[in-house]
Amino acid sequence: VTGSRVYPANEVTLLDSRSVQGELGWIASPLEGGWEEVSIMDEKNTPIRTYQVCNVMEASQNNWLRTDWITREGAQRVYIEIKFTLRDCNSLPGVMGTCKETFNLYYYESDNDKERFIRESQFGKIDTIAADESFTQVDIGDRIMKLNTEIRDVGPLSKKGFYLAFQDVGACIALVSVRVFYKKCPLTVRNLAQFPDTITGADTSSLVEVRGSCVNNSEEKDVPKMYCGADGEWLVPIGNCLCNAGHEEQNGECQACKIGYYKALSTDASCAKCPPHSYSVWEGATSCTCDRGFFRADNDAASMPCTRPPSAPLNLISNVNETSVNLEWSSPQNTGGRQDISYNVVCKKCGAGDPSKCRPCGSGVHYTPQQNGLKTTRVSITDLLAHTNYTFEIWAVNGVSKYNPSPDQSVSVTVTTNQAAPSSIALVQAKEVTRYSVALAWLEPDRPNGVILEYEVKYYEKDQNERSYRIVRTAARNTDIKGLNPLTSYVFHVRARTAAGYGDFSEPLEVTTNTVPSRIIGDGANST
């Protein structure tokens, strides 16, 4: 073989006379005196098998040269590239009437690959070939030679193969190279879809629609299609494929993400480095595993760092005020890498004798602003029992606390409530009003906080505005206030006392004494 010759990727060579080892051995007619196989030397001193004829002396030349059978390989249109040298008749004195400067190209389709003779009538003419000005200068044996290149195409072809023939009509010519090829759109990958080798259509204007298949580790986004043009070029790519999760595009392929990288979705994005506190140990990771002690919340994206529960709140301070407690604390030293930190308060009521025997405080205790999901670092707890041991736990929580709850995430304080004064009296009533007296009655406070020792009634004339008031004390829950002025408005307040002291006065009760005796039941509103 004369050496490997490189042709465009979109051309498939069916015959290349330059690549044939030894003699070409094509069939000539007549057998002698017409086309002759001659070896010439190229610039590398390598023999080139050529066919030459130079019968310029006699008129009416009809010298035929036929190639061997050429398989079609499914091509419907083939191209014939002829490189030849044609001698100018002017350089051959005395032959002007008989010398020609053209030759004819023919073809014959056949399923028979062993036809031995040339039957001229079977052949169809492709074209008359003439030397034009588009020759190239080629070194042949140190001689600069004008090498013409002509390309013709023929189709549509339908039989298994065909023969080419060259008819000389009296030229001085050398066929230096005959190459027969068809065009294909070569296997290619576009938008991660692979399109197979596709032979071009029968017409020079035809487009062949080809559906692509997604490359390994990818999936269709839109159906990938392209058109194979007659010149062997792919046209109009439509649709595309995307690399699967765990894979990224590299040089038209979907490569698995490297260890330490991941890709969560089928997108055109590249693999990303595992987020902080996570890792992947296999290639092709779709997510990264959290390090020991680190977690992802359900709504955390795969791209977010793995986080952990917060450490315990710091600097918990309690302030007991009788049966209320105010708690304050500082944020944890370690928030676990999250912003969604909040605090929960756990209240436990513990026995005085055995602090380990604690039970939940129940629903009677109130928390301001709330017990759970606190965003602030303070809470006020009220309505506790007096003289009771309470343990309060402040839990720092975030989005991953539920995966690893631990006492390390809380801080606690134990307090004892003081003896508290009774609560205020809710309802004071005027049972009987006369010109000079008012009979009052009331209910025990909601929270006596101990044994009520007595009640204190404070009253004054409304016009005096508490500048001058009188006090009456009683152990009972009623009393008669005497010595009042007739037809005068009085304001009454009642409070209870225990060992811890007085509670708050009740809301004011306004009563006006009569001009004539009468019985009126007060409801806490003004009585006239």
Epitope: M41, Q52, M57, G141, I144
Partner: antibody
Framework: QVQLLQSGAEVKKPGASVKVPCKAS????????MSWVRQAPGQGLEWMGW????????TYAQGFTGRFVFSLDTSVSTAYLQISSLKAEDTAVYYC??????????????WGQGTLVTVSS | EIVLTQSPATLSVSPGERATLSCRAS??????PAWYQQKPGQAPRLLIY???TRATGIPDRFSASGSGTDFTLTISRVEPEDFAVYYC????????FGQGTKVEIK
Amino acid sequence: QVQLLQSGAEVKKPGASVKVPCKASGYTFTSRAMSWVRQAPGQGLEWMGWINTNTGNPTYAQGFTGRFVFSLDTSVSTAYLQISSLKAEDTAVYYCARVRFTVYGDGMDVWGQGTLVTVSS
Amino acid sequence: EIVLTQSPATLSVSPGERATLSCRASQSVSSNPAWYQQKPGQAPRLLIYGASTRATGIPDRFSASGSGTDFTLTISRVEPEDFAVYYCQQYGPSWTFGQGTKVEIK
């Protein structure tokens, strides 16, 4: 096989004429031009010219016009060289040679055995 | 008219040696000359013609090269039957021969 057959030696007096035949065989006579070459004793080759065997049209080299005539008889596939008014300096071996035209260059691929023409008084 | 000058006039070589014969044209020519071999008492024999093509039956120890005005015939390993006179010949509208180079036994 392809052959060119020339006649034997000729001895001529100055001023005389000679006609040297060259009979071709083994190929189509009219398909190839015929060339004539002179070689004086101890000298090199001199191309005299050639004749188109198809048309009979001759081409003469410089110095070989006038007294030298190329002719043909295609019926017997023979070419002739006729020299008139012979001179002593015409003494030489005269060769006929078949011309090979090719696209890359020409040459004389088949030669007759030569005819020695001696011009002597 | 193109004049061909051959050198050397005589080349002495031993059998098996390489022989290089030169042919120089008086002006640049577009093609290689033909080369002929002539032995005493024999007609010339065509060795090489257009594009350095060897004539039928010529062994491959004969090769020709060159371009422009300088051309060379090379006998790679001279055999005893190669001792002869060699002529170059330029073709065209007018053909001319060089004066010849004699290759003799050293």
